[in-house]
Interface confidence: medium
C-alpha cells in the first residue's frame, strides 16, 4: 500500500520542530523555506533528504498516486531552491504525537481529493484542462486538437495513464463498410490513496448503467469517496461521471446505435503516463494507418450528399470538422439520426474546452 501520507506527515513534523512548532500547511514547500525563516538550510535539507528517501521506499506501491507525484516534484523543487546536496545526513524520524492543528482558516483543511481546489491554492489559478472526444464513425478529437476519422476495429485505448484507462470497442457500422462505430466503452478509475477504490464503468449500446460495475455510484468508503460520482439527467441516453479527485468530467452518450465519449481532464492528469503507454487516441489521435479520409465514404441508402449537408446544417451551421463528420456519418450510415452525435459532441466541446477559439476545427482534407 502507498505510504505517501506517512512520508508527508513525517516531513511536516520534522520541519515544524525546526521552526519551533509553527503552523501546519500543505506539504509542498512545507519548511517555509530555508535561510532566515527559522529553519536553517542544513536542517531543512536533512528533512528533505529524509522525505526523498521515504518516497523512494514507497515508490513501487505509489504509481499513479497524485499525492505521491506531487510530493516527488515538490521535494525536487525545494532541494534546488535551498541548494541541498542529494547525499548527506537525514533527519531522525519524528516522535509520534497528537495530530497538529490546522491554521484555523475557516475553510476545511486542504482536501487531497479536490484536485482543482488544491491546485488553485498553490498556483493562484485554476488548473489547465484538456478535452478529448470520440463519436460517430468514430471521429476522434484529441487533446491537441487533431481531428481524425478512424477505421479502428476491436478494442482501442482512448486514454491509458496513471489515473484513468478508457477503452472503446468498435465494430463495422454495416457489413463491408470501412467505417466503424463504438459499441462498448470501458473506463477504469484507478485506486487512489484516501480518495477512491478502483472503480470500473462499462457501457454498451442499449445499456448505459448509472452505476459502476460493483453497483456503487461513488468512489467507495474511503474519506474522499464522494470525489467520484456518477449521475444522469437522461437515463438510457446520457451518463456523466465526475472525478473531482483528478479534476475530470466524463460524458457518455448513446445516439443512433453508437456510443460517444467526451472528457474534460486536468492537464497534469492527462499527461501522467509512461513511454509504454504511448498508444492513446486522445493523445496522438488515430494512428496514420487507421485514418479514413472524408473522400473514402461509401454512401449507403437513399441519402444524397446535398440532403446530408442540409440535415447537418440545421444543427451545425458552421462548416467545421463537426459538420463534415456529421455529413460523413449520415452518408455512410444512411441514418439521419447521426446528426445528433456530432451536435452533442460540439455541445460537449463548448462546455469542456478551456479555449473556445479552438471550438471549431477545420480539417485540411
Amino acid at each position: 500500500q502507498c505510504k505517501i501520507l506517512r512520508c508527508n506527515a513525517e516531513y511536516v513534523s520534522s520541519t515544524l520542530s525546526l521552526r519551533g512548532g509553527g503552523s501546519s500547511g500543505a506539504l509542498r514547500g512545507g519548511g517555509g523555506g530555508g535561510r532566515g525563516g527559522g529553519v536553517g538550510s542544513g536542517g531543512l535539507c536533512r528533512a528533505l533528504r529524509s522525505y526523498a528517501l521515504c518516497t523512494r521506499r514507497t515508490a513501487r506501491t505509489c504509481r499513479g498516486d497524485l499525492a505521491f507525484h506531487s510530493a516527488v516534484h515538490g521535494i525536487e523543487d525545494l532541494m534546488i531552491q535551498h541548494n541541498c546536496s542529494r547525499q548527506g545526513p537525514t533527519a531522525p524520524p519524528p516522535p509520534r504525537g497528537p495530530a497538529l492543528p490546522g491554521a484555523g482558516s475557516g475553510l476545511p483543511a486542504p482536501d487531497p481529493c479536490d484536485y482543482e481546489g488544491r491546485f488553485s491554492r498553490l498556483h493562484g489559478r485554476p488548473p489547465g484542462f484538456l478535452h478529448c472526444a470520440s463519436f460517430g464513425d468514430p471521429h476522434v478529437r484529441s487533446f491537441h486538437h487533431h481531428f481524425h476519422t478512424c477505421r479502428v476495429q476491436g478494442a482501442w485505448p482512448l486514454l491509458d495513464n496513471d489515473f484513468l484507462f478508457v477503452q472503446a470497442t468498435s465494430s463495422p457500422m454495416a457489413l463491408g463498410a470501412n467505417a466503424t462505430a463504438t459499441r462498448k466503452l470501458t473506463i477504469i478509475f484507478k485506486n487512489m490513496q484516501e480518495c477512491i477504490d478502483q472503480k470500473v464503468y462499462q457501457a454498451e449500446v442499449d445499456n448505459l448503467p448509472v452505476a459502476f460495475e460493483d453497483g456503487s455510484i461513488n468512489g467507495g468508503d474511503r474519506p474522499g469517496g464522494s470525489s467520484l460520482s456518477i449521475q444522469t439527467a437522461n437515463p438510457g441516453n446520457h451518463v456523466e461521471i465526475q472525478a473531482a479527485y483528478i479534476g475530470t468530467t466524463i460524458i457518455i452518450r448513446q445516439t443512433a446505435g453508437q456510443l460517444s465519449f467526451s472528457i474534460k481532464v486536468a492537464e497534469d492528469v492527462a499527461m501522467a503516463f509512461s513511454a509504454e503507454q504511448d498508444l492513446q487516441l486522445c493523445v496522438g489521435g488515430c494512428p496514420p494507418s487507421q485514418r479514413l479520409s472524408r473522400s473514402e465514404r461509401n454512401r449507403r441508402g437513399a441519402i444524397t450528399i446535398d440532403t446530408a449537408r442540409r440535415l447537418c446544417k440545421e444543427g451545425l451551421p458552421v462548416e467545421d470538422a463537426y459538420f463534415h463528420s456529421c455529413v460523413f456519418d449520415v452518408l455512410i450510415s444512411g441514418d439521419p439520426n447521426f446528426t445528433v452525435a456530432a451536435q452533442a459532441a460540439l455541445e460537449d466541446a463548448r462546455a469542456f474546452l478551456p479555449d473556445l477559439e479552438k471550438l471549431h476545427l477545420f480539417p485540411s482534407d
Epitope: G25, G29, G31, G33, L107, R121, P126
Partner: antibody, heavy 117, light 110 residues
Framework: EVQLVESGGGLVQPGGSLRLSCAAS????????MTWVRQAPGKGLEWVSG????????YYADSVKGRFTISRDNSKNTLYLQMNSLRVEDTAIYYC??????????WGQGTLVTVSS | QSVLTQPPSASGTPGQRVTISCSGA????????VNWYQQFPGMAPKLLIY???QRPSGVPDRFSGSKSGTSASLAISGLQSEDEADYYC???????????FGTGTKVTVL
C-alpha cells in the same frame, strides 16, 4: 492565527515608485498563492496581481502590466508589490490576500497609496 | 472596469429573502468557481462563499450561493440589520488570465 499586515503605502507623485510589503504569519507561506487587490476611494474591488506558492508563476491585471511587479520571499514570509510609473488612477487601498481553495480566504487591513501632484 | 455585472443595490426588510445576481461569461463564471465577499464600510473584505456554494466556518447558513451557466447568485434569507454591507462576486477569467470582481451590490436593510 492567520495574519496579513500590509505596509509601504503613502503619498507619491505621478511617475514615482513605491514598494508595498505584506508580512504573513500563522501559516506556511510557500503553500499558498498570494494576491494583491485594490480599491479606489468609493469604488469596487479590483484584482491587481497574483503569485504562486513557489513564486514561479505571476499574473497581472492589464491595467498594471509592465509597471507593477509582484514577488515573494518565503523565507521571510513576505509578499511584495513593486509599483513603478504610478498614475493618479492607481490611488487606492491595496490589500494583500491569501489564496485558499481558489478564493481569497484571508485579507490584510490594507495600505493606502495616494498618487497626486 | 469590472467584467462581472451585479445590480448596484438590493434591499429588504428584516426577515426577508434578498438575492444578488452576478452575470459573467463562459471564460469566467461559465468555466470557473465563483466566490462571494462581504465588505463593511472602512473594513477589509471577508470571504462569504467559495466554490459557488461553500460556506467557510463561521458564516451563518442564511447565506447561500449557486451557479448556473454564466450566472451566479447569492441569497440572504432571513435578512438581518448586520447584513447591511457591500457584496462582491469574483471568479478567475481564463481569457484575461486573472481574477475578476463584480461591480458590487450595496445591501440595505429597511
Amino acid at each position: 492565527e492567520v495574519q496579513l499586515v500590509e505596509s509601504g503605502g503613502g503619498l507619491v507623485q505621478p511617475g514615482g515608485s513605491l514598494r508595498l510589503s505584506c508580512a504573513a504569519s500563522g501559516f506556511t507561506s510557500s503553500s499558498y498563492a498570494m494576491t494583491w487587490v485594490r480599491q479606489a476611494p468609493g469604488k469596487g474591488l479590483e484584482w491587481v496581481s497574483g503569485i504562486s506558492g513557489s513564486g514561479e508563476s505571476t499574473y497581472y491585471a492589464d491595467s498594471v502590466k509592465g509597471r507593477f511587479t509582484i514577488s515573494r520571499d518565503n523565507s521571510k514570509n513576505t509578499l511584495y508589490l513593486q509599483m513603478n510609473s504610478l498614475r493618479v488612477e492607481d490611488t487606492a487601498i491595496y490589500y494583500c490576500a491569501r489564496q485558499g481553495y481558489g478564493a481569497h480566504d484571508y485579507w490584510g487591513q490594507g495600505t493606502l497609496v495616494t498618487v497626486s501632484s | 472596469q469590472s467584467v462581472l455585472t451585479q445590480p448596484p443595490s438590493a434591499s429588504g426588510t428584516p426577515g426577508q429573502r434578498v438575492t444578488i445576481s452576478c452575470s459573467g461569461a463562459s471564460s469566467n463564471v461559465g468555466s470557473n468557481r465563483v466566490n462571494w465577499y462581504q465588505q463593511f464600510p472602512g473594513m477589509a473584505p471577508k470571504l462569504l462563499i467559495y466554490s459557488n456554494n461553500q460556506r467557510p466556518s463561521g458564516v451563518p447558513d442564511r447565506f447561500s450561493g449557486s451557479k448556473s451557466g454564466t450566472s451566479a447568485s447569492l441569497a440572504i434569507s432571513g435578512l438581518q440589520s448586520e447584513d447591511e454591507a457591500d457584496y462582491y462576486c469574483a471568479a478567475w477569467d481564463d481569457s484575461l488570465n486573472g481574477y475578476v470582481f463584480g461591480t458590487g451590490t450595496k445591501v440595505t436593510v429597511l
